[in-house]
Interface confidence: low
Amino acid sequence: NIDVCKLGTVTVQPAPVIPLGSAANISCSLNPKQGCSHYPSSNELILLKFVNDVLVENLHGKKVHDHTGHSSTFQVTNLSLGMTLFVCKLNCSNSQKKPPVPVCGVEISVGVAPEPPQNISCVQEGENGTVACSWNSGKVTYLKTNYTLQLSGPNNLTCQKQCFSDNRQNCNRLDLGINLSPDLAESRFIVRVTAINDLGNSSSLPHTFTFLDIVIPLPPWDIRINFLNASGSRGTLQWEDEGQVVLNQLRYQPLNSTSWNMVNATNAKGKYDLRDLRPFTEYEFQISSKLHLSGGSWSNWSESLRTRTPEEEPVGILDIWYMKQDIDYDRQQISLFWKSLNPSEARGKILHYQVTLQEVTKKTTLQNTTRHTSWTRVIPRTGAWTASVSAANSKGASAPTHINIVDLCGTGLLAPHQVSAKSENMDNILVTWQPPKKADSAVREYIVEWRALQPGSITKFPPHWLRIPPDNMSALISENIKPYICYEIRVHALSESQGGCSSIRGDSKHKAPVSGPHITAITEKKERLFISWTHIPFPEQRGCILHYRIYWKERDSTAQPELCEIQYRRSQNSHPISSLQPRVTYVLWMTAVTAAGESPQGNEREFCPQGKAN
């Protein structure tokens, strides 16, 4: 218990608080009749230095004065900023078994005088708020430092408040607790901050302000919006404000937007009409206020009002496409497809689509509504048919979009020329073409259609398509394009009543196939061998297969194999070869080639032709 100090006292010269870099003398004195019993001359006073409760030094070498058995003085230097504890102990040297006994202790604080406070800033929040000022205290003093904020103004107005900083709390803001009213709008006020601690004091420069300089209006509250006649584009924004507000700033944006629409409103009196809203859109609205047109500060933004504008009837034109398949000699299946309207065109939740198929001459009409984006019907193969689709929400329907049903690939003269497909990057394919050479009617538009070449893709997946104006000869397709997958791409040229098409395969990225085709049979017919195979499984193709290669060599031969390269056709799964010797056993295998290279070989089959060779 060093603070009881029954055995003696510890004193510090010049003081327990010293400036950084100064030295101090610490004297430890025993009280009368205290010390080592029987042997006063054996009293040894030692001084121990602690930082954060840890003993860091025994200062026996720093003694500058010693009255044997009674008192000792130690000089301490190089003390670091903050508090250091020194404990004086009595060591009775004749008795080694007993530990030194604490005599007394002292804390020495090392710090600096306060710097003049700077950057004083005062605010009054709202007309009924109180004046609060903050400042920059400068360097940490490491000592308890008192700060006094003084305000003076007209009519002998004076006011002051105090706070202090130490190692647990910081004082750089004070609320004076007084309210400045608008009738003092032209008056000037002066504030000053004074700092004082054990090592000195300092004062800020005076800071002058007016009512308008410091009063920040409260942000507007109770924000609401009324939509005129349930309009999705026009609404009146309303709010509550403090009485003195003359200027408002409104900002609003759709929730997924990154930029605000900004509006300034003078003397709005809590009301403003907005006329350019998007129907069926989630909006965020905020308002700020100011007390004076030219001076003063804007309030903080109000809390957000988030609301959705009402629906309006859809606008825009649906993008329609179709597929035609003959079922038998007098019936065909028409599958209509359309793309969803984007939100700015839908202007609400699309409840259904109205689909119409009409035979132009006989006036036969098939009508239906569907919630899907496709519709299939079987109709007669005779007659000229037209289709129309419109989208409906709770407020109405869009204008119907019409398309003539023609034989999409029926007119060879309308087929685009020199169609090519080049991979642009991992998820794009650039399709280019030349116009039909001898079209007897004008091309109204091109349709680029694509579908993954995988089993069942025609029945399972709707096509993807792009409409291209007649003067464009290229399209960058990206929707649903994945790397290492082969797509069938068709370019349709459409006139008023006819269609022509050209087809090509393409991929956005390719690798050599994982495996080669699997030879399933080798048969001999009319002195020719027919090799039959199964195609490589779709996931192992890794792009568009350009060629198959059939390899053969005599069994046990070390010579290079012969090969036959055949153009890849999806429908083809056999091929003849005719350069093999009869009654010689051959080993045959196949590989597949993409633009990235050749696959490993497929299975090997042995075969010995029996017939007469060519």
Partner: nanobody, 122 residues
Framework: QVQLQESGGGEVQAGGSLRLSCVAS????????TGWFRQAPGKERELVAG??????YYADSVKGRFTISRDNAKNTVYLQMNSLKPDDTAVYYC?????????????????RGQGTQVTVSS
Amino acid sequence: QVQLQESGGGEVQAGGSLRLSCVASGRTFSVYTTGWFRQAPGKERELVAGMSGTRTYYADSVKGRFTISRDNAKNTVYLQMNSLKPDDTAVYYCAERRYGGPSLVWDEYDYRGQGTQVTVSS
């Protein structure tokens, strides 16, 4: 008379771990401070870790790698040493004080062990 006995030293590769134990016998009091010191050849003895009540102290050179802990039921204090470096090679001593918190000064400790050798090779 309190006696302290260290164990757990030995040779280990850099990056390895050791756990030193210090068993106290003959103690009749329970309030104490324990320090683990080390002394490398030609260097001063230094405090690497201290424990007083629930408060711990670590030298900067071992912070985050060494952990001091106590099992009162077994009268044992441990020093878990991880990510050992060749610089950690030294004789490690355990010491106890009956009065005061951890001290950097070896002479301030009332009871001291004989030490255990720790060698870290690269």
